[in-house]
Amino acid sequence: PEPPTACREKQYLINSQCCSLCQPGQKLVSDCTEFTETECLPCGESEFLDTWNRETHCHQHKYCDPNLGLRVQQKGTSETDTICTCEEGWHCTSEACESCVLHRSCSPGFGVKQIATGVSDTICEPCPVGFFSNVSSAFEKCHPWTSCETKDLVVQQAGTNKTDVVCGPQDRLRA
């Protein structure tokens, strides 16, 4: 056999020889020879490798630092990293979720379009005509103005995007 110039999937070329890669969850101890296969060892506690590899060191599991508002969503294994998420009321500042910030509140005149999750912030929307929000909230949607007519009342003060209409009794015709 001629010395290889390329190797099969899950192999790597070293010293004109194709060696088996280490499986996920294991690290490389020594390259193969023509007499012995690649020597691999399992990653230690709190370490992982998630691909077929020739790494001599495993990666450390991510630490979900409670001081940064983080908590463990999914514990890491020898083949997967730990997944962090944020404490209630907080959300990740990036896709990697390395720190958290408090969910934003929607100011008066704005309502919650989408409630925040551990990985996404609150989405606010302006209250359209006929709706209002008079509080700063991370949960409240825009509320519809009160319908004075259904209460047999009349609008005494028009509503805005921050205030409800004010209803009052209908004026009585004098005799």
């Epitope: 004109s16 020879t33 023509e34 012995t36 020597e39």
Partner: antibody
Framework: EVQLLESGGGLVQPGGSLRLSCAAS????????MSWVRRAPGKGLEWVSG????????YYADSVKGRFTISRDNSKNTLYLQMNSLRAEDTAVYYC??????????WGQGTLVTVSS | DIQMTQSPSSLSASVGDRVTITCRAS??????LNWYQEKPGKAPKLLIY???SLQSGVPSRFSGSGSGTDFTLTISSLQPEDFATYYC?????????FGQGTKLEIK
Amino acid sequence: EVQLLESGGGLVQPGGSLRLSCAASGFTFSSYAMSWVRRAPGKGLEWVSGIGSYGGGTYYADSVKGRFTISRDNSKNTLYLQMNSLRAEDTAVYYCARYVNFGMDYWGQGTLVTVSS
Amino acid sequence: DIQMTQSPSSLSASVGDRVTITCRASQSISSYLNWYQEKPGKAPKLLIYAASSLQSGVPSRFSGSGSGTDFTLTISSLQPEDFATYYCQQYGRNPPTFGQGTKLEIK
């Protein structure tokens, strides 16, 4: 037809030296890793040493490291084992073998080395 | 070095018998194991490589199985020419090491 023929065995005193040869034929010698394996009287097989193809590395069992040297001459299709500082426990039949995919697929008939005073 | 322990050390059986020889590694070697047959005055012969693959030209009555630390060589129906000594050999760690052998004798 693949053939491996060992020679160079014999009786030697403790502390002495011997050089074993293995003449290969019937295949492209330079393309294969080769090894030496021995079997002591009444004992099992023991892998002694190996040499890679294409000028590859050399490897030894701990029991012979520093005393034995494996080499090859691809122009002569010959494998060698230089054995120095021989001990009584090195007494054995020595086989040369061809390696393919981590297995020894062809073996010679062996040559007897006796270390005794 | 990895220690390879074969059992039994010797075995008496009759032609037609099904025979199993086991080999245990002192640490995991995945499926990096070969089996050899040796007859008196003859060179050893490779039977099985990579724990379960039959070497070209070897009769199909020979089979191998196992991974990790425990391996077996099975001869489904013993033939007169199968009486010999059998060795396992690991290649998961340097240096390669053999088991002590199992001598298969005629009952």
